[in-house]
């Protein structure tokens, strides 16, 4: 049920031990009683007791102290449950039997007579505290108190409320005295079923299933679920939003695992040639003469340059190289001539020209013909005039470069440039790099292109040393020192040959 | 909403050609560079090529060098892979991707990926 109705009888006399018809009990009135607690009716009248009714064993004889009792036969106070709203108001007949049967069961034994009766009608909150009162009659007097409390798990003026706390699935809460939940430590919601994440998880990337946890949800990963987990392969690169790739300063490629600077980090050029990081590798080397390879790390043959004259033939030395030369030459290159026009030197139509009175000769040669008697066909390619990779084809008494994809010009010498399209903002400075173009920016502006106005201009405190030029970087904080000839570190604070004690990007 | 969507993968066998389309919507197609990347199962992804915004710029992974060509149309937004010689090794899922700016540095978003099977 939802309350209980408590009736506490606290002592009942009759002294003269009298029925209510006037007559006297023999030997003496065995006293037990009835209760009848209906719905409040301004006159009380019989029928059923609507809100319940309770009989006593026999309690004593003529005048008695009733005693608290809370088990077994006889308990006090008398209970009467009801599993229905409390309404507020009520009726209570209280009636005083004599018995002269058994004292457990009164009610069943034939011969019971009326002693007294009270009525009482009236209102009665829900509530702790009893009710005292007391009736009586000529013959007799009753006194009682009484109350209306809620059963376990019903709270309410009406104990209409039903709360019950648990710690499961479904809930986690005590009862407040008005039915109302208190939530165990951890727990939130309506019903106390939601529980309170680690302080900080993340509201979006982050849930729980149980207090103090944090579960992050795919994309994301941290203590508190606020960092996101870049794209699967991202070498140099972070993200701000899940499975992003954003490469590091200096990094290129879909997934940053190509280093813009290579030439810096890696120093792949051998033998004093130039790199430049640029070309399909992120890197190209221009070799000094006598190199070559991908690195210029190849010696090329001494002959490679074809230093003899006039058809001689050329053998490789240890360190240097000799001439053989043909009949009518000598020298080192095989420069002079023991010929003279007499002999017809001049091939392929040269006509010859003496010099120093008869004793040598020069041939002027015809188109496409060189060599000291004009015995070469000219070769327009052999001066490798094509840069940047570009094909040399020769097209009779012309050649032509075939440009490799990105290159353009006679020798395929300018790029096809990303800077074409001014991508730089604020006057910035366009560097067309393999993977795209990077600008440096003036002083006061930053970002990719230069978009980003600094309010706190980096370079503005003078912050590199020796004549260096200051740049801003990326962020609004970061500068970058240029340094003079002579002087290396990150703010070219320091003569080279006095190296830093700590790494540093030039 | 950017969207790539590839498509043109495929059943080939060894020695065989494939081209692949990647078609763009959703932001200014030639302002951005577009690439190619692959995954085989239980193995890494590996970035295979890309072109930068002007189509000035492409590179390519030496594993895929002299096979593969990239090209894109910035007129129909779309952007091709022509794979020739195929091998068993190239199967894989292929995405196209873009890292949202003119130069190949990163990935910002990517398709949904086709299947190419090359099996004799």
């Known amino acids: 049920g939802s309350g209980i109705f408590q009736l506490r009888l606290q002592e009942f006399v009759n002294q003269r031990g009298m029925l209510a018809n006037g007559q006297s009990c023999e030997p003496g009135c065995r006293t037990f009683f009835r209760i009848c607690l209906k719905h409040f009716q301004a006159t009380f009248s019989e029928g059923p007791c609507t809100f319940g009714n309770v009989s006593t064993p026999v309690l004593g004889t003529n005048s008695f102290v009733v005693r608290d009792k809370n088990s077994g036969s006889g308990r006090n106070p008398l209970q009467l449950p009801f599993n229905f709203t409390w309404p507020g108001t009520f009726s209570l007949n209280i009636q005083a039997w004599h018995t002269p049967g058994d004292d457990l069961r009164p009610e069943t034994s034939p011969g019971n007579s009326l002693i007294s009766q009270i009525i009482i009608q009236g209102s009665l909150a829900v509530g702790k505290i009893w009710r005292t009162d007391e009736q009586n009659d000529t013959l007799t007097r009753l006194s009682y108190s009484y109350r209306v409390i809620c059963s376990d798990n019903y709270y309410g003026e009406s104990c209409s409320r039903l709360c019950k706390k648990r710690d499961d699935h479904f809930g986690h809460y005590e009862c407040q005295p008005d039915g109302s939940l208190s939530c165990l430590p951890g727990w939130t919601g309506k019903y106390c079923d939601q529980p309170i994440c680690l302080s900080g998880c993340h509201e979006q990337n982050g849930y729980c299933s149980k207090p103090d946890e944090c579960i992050c949800r795919p994309g994301w990963q941290g203590r508190l679920c606020n960092e996101c987990i870049p794209h699967n392969g991202c070498r140099h690169g972070t993200c701000s939003i899940p499975w992003q790739c954003a490469c590091d300063e200096g990094w290129g490629g879909l997934f940053c695992d190509q280093d813009l600077n290579y030439c810096t980090h890696h120093s792949p050029c051998k033998n004093g040639s130039t790199c430049s990081n640029s070309g399909p590798k992120g890197y190209t080397c221009t070799c000094l003469p006598g190199y070559t390879g991908e690195h210029c790390e190849l010696g090329l043959s001494k002959c490679a340059s074809n230093p003899c004259r006039n058809g001689g033939s050329c053998k490789d030395q240890e360190n240097s190289y000799h001439c053989l030369c043909p009949p009518g030459y000598y020298g080192q290159h095989c420069e002079h001539s023991t010929l003279t026009c007499a002999d017809s030197p001049c091939f392929n139509g040269g006509s010859c020209r003496e010099r120093n009175q008869g004793s040598s000769y020069a041939c002027e040669c015809p188109p496409n013909f060189t060599g000291s008697n004009c015995e070469k066909k000219v070769d327009r390619c052999t001066s490798n005039p094509c840069a940047n990779g570009g094909q040399c084809q020769n097209r009779g008494p012309s050649r032509t470069c075939r440009c490799r994809p990105g290159f353009t010009g006679t020798h395929c010498e300018l790029h096809i440039s990303d800077c074409a399209r001014s991508p730089c903002a604020h006057g910035g400075t366009c560097h067309d790099l393999e993977n795209g173009p990077v600008c440096t920016c003036p002083a006061g502006f930053s970002g990719r292109r230069c978009e980003v106005r600094i309010t706190h201009d980096a370079c503005a405190s003078g912050p590199c040393f020796n004549g260096a030029t200051c740049y801003t970087g990326l962020s609004p904080n970061n500068f970058v020192c240029n340094c003079p000839y002579g002087f290396v570190g990150s703010r070219c604070e320091f003569p080279v040959g006095l190296p830093p004690s700590f790494p540093w990007v030039a | 909403e950017v969207q790539l969507v590839e498509s043109g993968g495929g059943l080939v066998q060894p020695g065989g050609s494939l081209r692949l389309s990647c078609a763009a919507s959703g932001f200014t197609f030639d302002d951005y560079a577009i690439g190619w990347f692959r995954q085989a199962p239980g193995k890494e992804p590996e970035g295979i090529s890309c072109i930068s915004s002007s189509g000035g710029i492409t590179y390519y992974a030496d594993s895929v060098k002299g096979r593969f060509t990239t090209s894109r149309d910035n007129a129909k937004n779309t952007v091709y892979l022509q794979m020739n010689s195929l091998k068993p090794e190239d199967t894989a899922v292929y995405y196209c991707?873009?890292?949202?700016?003119?130069?190949?540095?990163?990935?910002?978003?990517t398709g949904q990926g086709t299947q190419v099977t090359v099996s004799s």
């Open positions: 991707a873009t890292p949202g700016i003119a130069a190949c540095r990163g990935i910002h978003y």
